[in-house]
């Protein structure tokens, strides 16, 4: 029972994970600026892996999408590429921890497939959540360095002179989303990897062999070691070994002329 | 690289109109606020007027009435129309627009080199 609960638990921390690292990624709001020198309007900025938006204190608000791949940098494309993976592994997780659920009876599965079904789910969480919390903290990282370079770049073109505007970088909603998001997941897929081991069959049943001699039959347990006369108090041989599993132990057994070897 | 290129700028009489353009262009992904500074010899530099990205609109006192500022997204480009110009605003006319910039991810204050007003009979 603590097994089946571990597993659900798991699985629905999972799930709402990997719901949070999918809302992270979509979400606009991996960064926010404040432009406070602004000469004409407050002008708040924000972005996310795809698209960056301005609003004006007067309302107006505008997104506009990267729709090119090669001015953007290379941390930017990397960051997507580990929410990518982190959003594709947990989506494949989810799947194959459905059917390794216990409480869910699909044909005359074996608890063992079960097991390893429930272990490959519980490794691909842990990996989707790494991924999401290393996405997350290599763009944070990325904001924190332009917030210290931002005071050294400054250089004359030929059209006059550029300078980095005077921004106050600040986190945005999607970096905390993304952070939990991704512990969420890791911590299901914990879960679902020690809910494994309480799945897997922890020891091999054996069966009896029984070996009769001609006059005494000496039943030889490999599993016990204990041997018993076919006469007498023991004549029904007592199971030694009880796994689950019917033995010919379990049948009366007689000494006779014909019994062999 | 990015830059803005201001013209329209010359001689004219007091009483007279001029339309100075900024145009901003190279790899800029968005340009947020245009603003217009002048400076005059041997003086401080100083807003004329500003407009942002959604229309919001600054204007110095000693302008309001007379100059209207007026930008077109599509073309990153900004227009100061001057009418009833005096001998006071005779200036050197820049250029300043805010691009934000996806390549650093950070905001871009663009000048550029000035065109020159002088209003004079």
């Known amino acids: 029972m603590a097994v089946t609960a571990c597993q659900g638990l798991g699985f629905v921390v999972s799930l709402i994970g990997i719901a949070g690292i999918i809302a992270a990624t979509c979400m606009d709001q991996w960064s926010t600026q404040d432009l406070y020198n602004n000469p004409v309007t407050a002008v708040f900025n924000y972005q996310g892996l795809w698209r960056s938006c301005v609003r004006e204190s007067s309302g107006f608000t505008e997104c506009r999408g990267y729709f090119t791949l090669l001015g953007l940098p290379a941390m930017l494309q990397a960051v997507r590429a580990l929410m990518i993976v982190g959003i594709v592994l947990g989506a494949i997780g989810l799947l194959v921890s459905i059917f390794a659920l216990k409480c869910i009876r699909i044909g005359s599965m074996e608890d063992s497939a079960k097991a390893n079904m429930t272990l490959t789910s519980g490794i691909m969480f842990i990996v989707s959540g790494l991924c999401a919390i290393a996405g997350v903290s290599v763009f944070a990282n990325m904001l924190v360095t332009n917030f210290w370079m931002s005071t050294a770049n400054m250089y004359t073109g030929m059209g006059g002179m550029v300078q980095t505007v005077q921004t106050r970088y600040t986190f945005g909603a999607a970096l905390f989303v993304g952070w939990v998001a991704g512990g969420l997941t890791l911590i299901g897929g914990v879960m679902m990897c020690i809910a494994c081991r309480g799945l897997a069959p922890e020891e091999t049943n054996y069966k009896a062999v029984s070996y009769h001699a001609s006059g005494h039959s000496v039943a030889y347990k490999p599993g016990g070691f204990k041997a018993s006369t076919g006469f007498g108090s023991n004549t029904k041989n007592k199971k030694i070994y009880d796994g689950g599993a019917r033995t010919e132990d379990e049948v009366q057994s007689y000494p006779s002329k014909h019994d062999y070897v | 690289e990015v830059q803005v290129v201001e013209s329209g700028g010359g001689l004219v009489q007091p009483g007279g109109s001029l339309r100075l353009s900024c145009a901003a262009s190279?790899?800029?992904?968005?340009?947020?606020?245009m603003v217009w500074y002048r400076q005059a010899p041997g003086k401080q530099r100083e807003l004329v007027a500003g407009i942002s990205r959604g229309g919001t609109t600054n204007y110095a006192h000693s302008v309001k009435g007379r100059f209207t500022i007026s930008r077109d997204n599509a073309k990153n480009t900004m227009y100061l129309q001057m009418n009833s110009l005096k001998s006071e605003d005779t200036a050197t006319y820049y250029c300043?627009?805010?691009?934000?910039?996806?390549?650093?991810?950070?905001?871009?204050?663009?000048w550029g080199q000035g065109t020159l007003v002088t209003v004079s009979a």
């Open positions: 190279g790899n800029i992904f968005r340009i947020d606020t």
């Open positions: 300043n627009a805010q691009a934000w910039d996806v390549g650093t991810i950070r905001y871009l204050e663009v």
